[in-house]
């Protein structure tokens, strides 16, 4: 805490400008009104404040403003925002995309730091959901945000706001979360013509069903290999190999790069070696011709 | 939430034609395939005849091809079945569905209508 | 056109029962064989799709096996609820067939 000291003669400051960066710590806490302070907040950003003399800023608002800042300070609050810790924020109400995008401009080029984490999902919170705009918004700044969302979360993002994401944002989900996205997208683009429809869907497959995957076997898609190692194991399964070879069209001869990776090796497990012998790949590892295929769980539920 | 309705129902006269009507609300009707499905009184379920999203491709049972035609109008959100040379044997209530899936004929979904009963009878 | 023989035709069974149904193909289906329920005066319900994946909203206790040729459904605990008419279905090849049905009883 810093001392409380008089402010010396002459050196109350009547508006935040240039000339308070020559002021010691204890004469801006004497001599700054908070009021002046939050009501002058937009100008802190154009003054080459020290880090301790941020320190004692914040500390003036943090003395006016107990219960949490008002949005009309969080807005202006520019490089003062990386001096507050996530029980700071979590006082916050914000509710103005235009306060959210001021803060993240003061993060811009690093990572999502805790006090970010803790800001966006206030965020969020207040909506209620992830509307499009928002998701705009936060995939603009941290391409991967999507991606760091729990299933859970990510039920809250309407279908509307799946057109908001690009390919980009979905490159470090998990299964988990593509299964949650996957059946939005599905809806969101349902109104497209089959070939749009495909490319915009693509980057959402991770999570789509094996009935989704027979459809647009019957469309003439071309997937390309990368799409289909993200393909989930159990949906691939019990596409036959007439449908994988619709499926991947001019790409199916990447299979046999692929042939010892999921889902490509247990795809393969579950065909019948003379259907994979007639894509000409030299794919191995099929049902020998001739043999029954024995299903465990089959056999436990007959005994 | 997802309605599918059928009508044109009736008793009908062996040889002669009807025609049945489903009308789609509370889903992208154009984006799935369509299915009829009948089931005879007391007796099982039979696929009768299935259509692409655009009306592209059709196909159909052994037992009615040539008799027959499913089409459907996407303006309106109607799926239709023609029936044109009925027999004794085509008694049955005639379900519409939906497929599962979207852009493609490839499952029955959970979505049917409640059906309209065809009696062919003289 | 694939042939679909269930087996059996009928069952009574007392509730928390174990239920087995089976459905065999004429030929190979690979795993495009499906489950549906149908209750008295009602369209019939989605249950398992492709022999094993259980369909949204439909209780644990059903669950399904198999591929090829040989195929089962179980209900693991049967409840009055589930007194109804249980079809398998393939959407291997056209035409799409069904098999006759087994009715399941409550006693």
């Known amino acids: 805490e810093v001392e409380k000291t008089a402010c010396p003669s002459g050196k109350k400051a009547r508006e935040i400008d240039e000339s308070l960066i020559f002021y010691k710590k204890w004469e801006l806490e004497a001599c700054v009104d908070a009021a002046l302070l939050a009501t002058q907040m937009d100008r802190v950003n154009a003054i080459p404040f020290t880090y301790e003399q941020l320190d004692v800023l914040k500390h003036k608002l943090d003395e006016l403003y107990p219960q949490g800042y008002p949005e009309s300070v969080i807005q202006h609050l520019g490089y003062l925002f990386l001096k507050m810790s996530p029980e700071d924020i979590r006082k916050w109400n914000v509710t103005s995309l235009e306060t959210l995008k001021a803060l993240l401009e003061v993060n811009k080029g690093h990572e999502m730091s805790p006090q970010v984490a803790t800001l966006i999902d206030r965020f969020v919170k207040g909506r209620g959901q992830l509307d499009k705009d928002t998701l705009d918004t936060l995939t603009a700044f941290y391409p991967g945000y999507l991606c760091s969302l729990s299933p859970e979360e990510l039920s809250s993002v309407p279908p509307s706001s799946i057109w908001a994401v690009r390919p980009q944002d979905l490159d470090t989900c998990d299964p988990r979360q593509l299964d949650v996205l996957y059946p939005k997208a599905r809806l969101a683009f349902q109104n497209m013509n089959g070939s749009e429809y495909f490319v915009k869907i693509q980057s959402f497959l991770g999570g789509a069903p094996t009935e989704d995957l027979k459809a647009l076997s019957q469309q003439n898609v071309s997937m390309d290999l990368a799409t289909f190692m993200k393909l989930r194991t159990d949906a691939v399964l019990p596409l036959t190999v007439a449908e994988v070879q619709k499926l991947l069209g001019p790409h199916v001869e990447g299979l046999k790069a692929e042939e010892r990776h999921r889902p490509v090796r247990d795809w393969i497990l579950r065909q019948r070696q003379d259907d994979l012998d007639t894509l000409g790949l030299g794919l191995q590892g099929g049902i020998p011709n001739g043999y029954l295929v024995l299903d465990l769980s089959m056999q436990e539920a007959l005994s | 939430q997802v309605q599918l309705v059928e009508s044109g129902g009736g008793v009908v006269q062996p040889g002669r034609s009807l025609r049945l009507s489903c009308a789609a609300s509370g889903f992208t009707f154009s984006s799935y395939g369509m299915h009829w499905v009948r089931q005879a009184p007391g007796k099982g379920l039979e696929w009768v005849a299935a259509i692409w999203y655009d009306g592209s491709n059709k196909y159909y049972a052994d037992s009615v091809k040539g008799r027959f035609t499913i089409s459907r109008d996407n303006s309106k959100n109607m799926l239709y079945l023609q029936m044109n040379s009925l027999r004794a044997e085509d008694t049955a209530v005639y379900y519409c569905?939906?497929?599962?899936?979207?852009?493609?004929?490839?499952?029955?979904?959970?979505?049917w209508g409640q059906g309209t009963l065809v009696t062919v009878s003289s | 056109e694939i042939v679909l023989t269930q087996s059996p035709d009928f069952q009574s069974v007392t509730p928390k029962e174990k239920v087995t149904i089976t459905c065999r193909a004429s030929?190979?289906?690979?795993?495009?064989l499906h489950w549906y329920r149908q209750k008295p005066d009602q369209s019939p319900k989605l249950l398992i799709k492709y022999a094993s994946q259980s369909f949204s909203g439909v209780p644990s206790r059903f669950s399904g096996g198999g591929s090829g040729t040989d195929f089962t459904l179980t209900i693991n605990s049967l409840e009055a609820e589930d007194a109804a008419t249980y079809y398998c279905?393939?959407?291997?090849?056209?035409?799409?067939?069904f098999g006759q049905g087994t009715k399941v009883e409550i006693k």
């Open positions: 569905a939906r497929d599962l899936s979207i852009f493609g004929v490839v499952i029955l979904s959970d979505y």
């Open positions: 279905h393939q959407s291997s090849s056209l035409p799409w067939t």
């Open positions: 030929q190979s289906i690979g795993s495009s």
